[in-house]
Amino acid sequence: RTTTCFGDGCQNTASRCKNGGTWDGLKCQCPNLYYGELCEEVVSSIDIGPPETISAQMELTVTVTSVKFTEELKNHSSQEFQEFKQTFTEQMNIVYSGIPEYVGVNITKLRLGSVVVEHDVLLRTKYTPEYKTVLDNATEVVKEKITKVTTQQIMINDICSDMMCFNTTGTQVQNITVTQYDPEEDCRKMAKEYGDYFVVEYRDQKPYCISPCEPGFSVSKNCNLGKCQMSLSGPQCLCVTTETHWYSGETCNQGTQKSLVYGHHHHHH
């Protein structure tokens, strides 16, 4: 946020940039939280725009019995590994085909024991306030589906009649990691020393980090004809004086007619 300064007073302004603002020769360049000619005003909204998508990663282990382990499978650039990766990916794409959040699989390691496949199942969903529930549900469906396929697709008489066969007991979910996005936490952090006064409100499922000085939200402070200003003690209404009235009160809702006051004073004199 920048405010340009013209004229003789500019040199003075340079040394007066507040709140960590820096002078660039023309104006005070204000840090994110501030604006105004001298960076003296606190913004009333902070952009905490969520990521478009939220990801989750499930660390799984399955045992493939239809392939015999060879040393070449340890080398990720070998033809053996590349072929295994292709077949395994195709098989998992079939297994998880009914899960809209499913993105793909990533093999991290192949080891002996027929072929023990350490891999990640990658999930992704559009950001909504319910993203945790969506991804939690998806991880449960992943568990169900991999358990089902590793129970059904098994070797019979030493031969696999499916794309891949598995050891029923070799399926394990090691870890589940969901990308953390906490708008309330982000809002508090970005508002720094004003964190107690900034809140998150949602519009069209998008979070907005606002102070009561931002109009149009349920927490918005109505200062009537006054101006809402944030201070370290919270939002305050700065009341205005018009040609005819003085305004006062916490929300500048008490108007006093100047003529009455002047008349009253005149009477006392």
Epitope: V67, F84, Q86, T87, I159, M163, M164, C165
Partner: nanobody, 123 residues
Amino acid sequence: EVQLVESGGGLVQPGGSLRLSCAASGFTFSRGSMSWFRQAPGKEREGVAIISSDGWTGYADSVKGRFTISQDNAKNSLYLQMNSLRAEDTAVYYCAASFLVLRALNPKAWHYWGQGTMVTVSS
């Protein structure tokens, strides 16, 4: 690049024999696996026999005791000896290869394929 070329197909009477061959290039028989599949008109491709570099062989129940799979590493060739042929053995026979030591007779598990050779069993 792996290339597989089948030969040896033809017309044979029920009870007769045929020997199919598959010449491989770009593929080493000492690693991985090779197999024979077949596809009858209007049916899905099905596994017939498999041989791996560790010497393991496997057969579909429908051909056990009648068909024998073998390979000649020096000639880089795969064979399928078919005895006691039946009308239901009529199909296009395909040779398939994999760099993996496979125990699978599902076509989706195999990556490299020949063009096929026709076997007709009829009197």
